[in-house]
């Protein structure tokens, strides 16, 4: 019997300082570019090597960005979200949602090393 996949959802405030080449990540999503079905939220699709986000280390690909400098990202067109980041200034505060996949064992869990497992 297969274990089911659950998700552990956590939120975090990440403060980034814009580097010489900017914040250093890509986004997907928006009301006109739904990346996740039935969710027009904004998600991180790429972290650029040696960019501000990569050097900070906390923002991850797949994270959902809930707000930028306190401004909610709900119900935004994709380009409006991009522009919000571009105009966010030198010090940028991101409220993000991490979604960590957790593999649960099957019901009637067998101990490690059990060859029938």
């Amino acid at each position: 019997m297969n274990g089911r996949v659950d998700y552990l959802v956590t939120e975090e405030e990440i403060n980034l300082t814009r580097g010489p080449s900017g914040l250093g990540f890509n986004i997907v999503g928006g009301t006109d570019q739904q990346y996740v079905s039935n969710d027009s939220g904004i998600y991180v699709s790429r972290i650029k090597e040696n960019g501000a986000a990569a050097l900070d280390g906390r923002l991850q690909e797949g994270d959902k960005i809930l707000s930028v400098n306190g401004q909610d990202l709900k119900n935004l067109l994709h380009q409006d979200a991009v522009d919000l980041f571009r105009n966010a200034g030198y010090a940028v505060s991101l409220r993000v949602q991490h979604r960590l996949q957790v593999q649960n064992g099957p019901i009637g869990h067998r101990g490690e090393g059990d060859p029938s497992g």
Partner: nanobody
Framework: QVQLVESGGGLVQAGDSLRLSCAAS????????MGWFRQAPGKEREFVAH????????YYADSVKGRFTISRDNAKNTMYLQMNSLKPDDTAVYYC?????????????????????WGQGTQVTVS
């Protein structure tokens, strides 16, 4: 993993036209930021054109402006480069390139490091 396959290259005469295609894998094609680059023998890879996720924004190298047109069909997972009034200087291997999503920083269209996935290229020769 994104896979890109270019097609449409060939041998043509100066003044002729060609249309290159770049077919991409992945269900999220409509989120891709895409570009065309080219590399002539003995030269560095050179930026040609760029298109945003929706096709509403395009950008061209000065050397091709007014002659080349970049476009995309998100329903077909394909990007195109229509090349008119071809010149011998346009002879090169043409590559399509992709990054997933839109950069939140001012986009450096011509920087190959902005792109994560590359096709194998298609040869264009203008005699």
């Amino acid at each position: 993993q994104v896979q890109l396959v270019e097609s449409g290259g060939g041998l043509v005469q100066a003044g002729d036209s060609l249309r290159l295609s770049c077919a991409a894998s992945g269900r999220t094609f409509s989120t891709y930021t895409m570009g065309w680059f080219r590399q002539a023998p003995g030269k560095e890879r050179e930026f040609v054109a760029h298109i945003n996720w929706s096709g509403s924004s395009t950008y061209y190298a000065d050397s091709v402006k007014g002659r080349f047109t970049i476009s995309r069909d998100n329903a077909k997972n394909t990007m195109y480069l229509q090349m008119n009034s071809l010149k011998p200087d346009d002879t090169a291997v043409y590559y399509c390139a992709v990054t997933i999503g839109s950069p939140v920083d001012s986009y450096r269209h011509g920087d190959p490091l902005e792109y994560d996935y590359w096709g194998q290229g298609t040869q264009v020769t203008v005699s």
